[in-house]
């Protein structure tokens, strides 16, 4: 089941997935002036490797067919070298079964990657430089199924200006530690939802159908 919407944004924080669940799809998007090869529209996480490698080729028509064919022939070779690109693995991210690592960069890719996450995917939040975390729970958001719909849980993270950090800590202590809101009950009321409402800019799954078509 694909996740509707994007994970929630937290002010002065940024998030990313540290690994990707089996079934995750990544669109092969190229920057202006380049286009993806017709055969390589997306990559899919299968087991713990990606199904193929995205490739971008110049829009200028002086590229001969030979070059494109040569690129395709090198695909298999590229897939084997991808694993050699990471000489060190951090402790928290061994290659888990059913998880893929971030695909390495490809030439002339678009600056923004469009992922289509699946149920159970988690993303990890960190405060951006200049801000410190006031944490009341895990700084993660998980795509969960609730009442037949997918949605992202709210990360328990507040990022405050590090120059003001001590002030926030002092006020937290004087108020006593507040518990983060408990998980809501399993019943499915018609009018409410447990998930934060997505912003207008968040991508719905319908976009997936459009972006998957070869331009």
């Amino acid at each position: 089941e694909l996740c509707l919407y994007d994970p929630p944004e937290v002010p002065n924080a940024t998030f990313k997935a540290l690994s990707y669940k089996n079934g995750t799809i990544l669109n092969c998007e190229c920057k202006r002036g380049f286009r993806r090869l017709k055969e390589l529209v997306y990559m899919r996480c299968l087991g713990n490797s990606w199904s193929s490698n995205c490739q971008c080729t110049s829009n200028s028509h002086d590229k001969s067919r030979k070059q494109v064919t040569a690129q395709l022939e090198h695909q298999k070779e590229q897939q084997t070298t991808t694993d050699m690109q990471k000489p060190t693995q951090s402790m928290h991210q061994e290659n888990l079964t059913g998880h893929c690592r971030e695909p390495p960069p490809w030439k002339h890719e678009d600056s923004k990657r469009i992922y289509h996450f699946v149920e159970g995917q988690s993303v990890h939040y960190e405060c951006i430089p200049g801000y410190k975390a006031l944490q009341r729970g895990p700084a993660i958001s998980i795509c969960k199924m609730k009442c037949g719909k997918t949605g992202w849980t709210q990360p328990q993270l507040t990022c405050v200006d590090e120059r003001e950090h001590h002030r926030f800590l002092a006020s937290e202590e004087s108020q006593g530690s507040r518990n983060s809101s408990p998980e809501s009950e399993t019943s499915c009321p018609i009018t409410t939802t447990d998930f934060p409402q997505p912003t207008e800019t968040t991508a719905m799954t319908e976009t997936f159908v459009l972006t998957m078509e070869y331009k």
Epitope: E9, F15, K16, Q85, H108, K112, E126, P129
Partner: nanobody
């Protein structure tokens, strides 16, 4: 396959300077943090410095602040590390690395410190003699 190619390493006397370059032909800088790690003999690899391709935010490990400067030339797909007032303890193999930015084109230094990068160069040796 996109590759990172380092150059500029060498032997220098304490107090001297070196400028390292990392060429990443075809890399879309706007989507990545790009920078330098180093590994001295018998020590763990450590993240020295990075610059974000989105807005040019920079980070330095405490021991090099004020001595090292990172910069990038997006048109040339190259990142530079200007190393001044070098010390014998700067002796190490210096590796260029890239890591995908997080949401909204932002990056957290904790990710750099974790050392879990998306792509690595082969490294260039820097030796500072006393």
């Amino acid at each position: 396959q996109l590759q990172l190619v380092e150059s500029g390493g060498g032997l220098v006397q304490a107090g001297g300077s070196l400028r390292l370059s990392c060429a990443a032909s075809g890399l879309t800088f706007e989507g990545y943090a790009i920078g330098w790690f180093r590994q001295a003999p018998g020590k763990e690899r450590e993240g020295v410095s990075y610059i974000t391709g989105s807005d040019g935010t920079t980070y330095y490990i405490n021991s090099v602040k004020g001595r090292f400067t990172i910069s990038s030339d997006n048109a040339k797909s190259t990142v530079y590390l200007q190393m001044n007032t070098l010390k014998p303890e700067d002796t190490a193999v210096y590796y260029c690395a890239v890591d995908r930015l997080g949401s909204q084109g932002r990056y957290a230094s904790a990710w750099w410190r974790s050392g879990d990068m998306d792509l690595w160069g082969k490294g260039t040796q820097v030796t500072v003699s006393s």
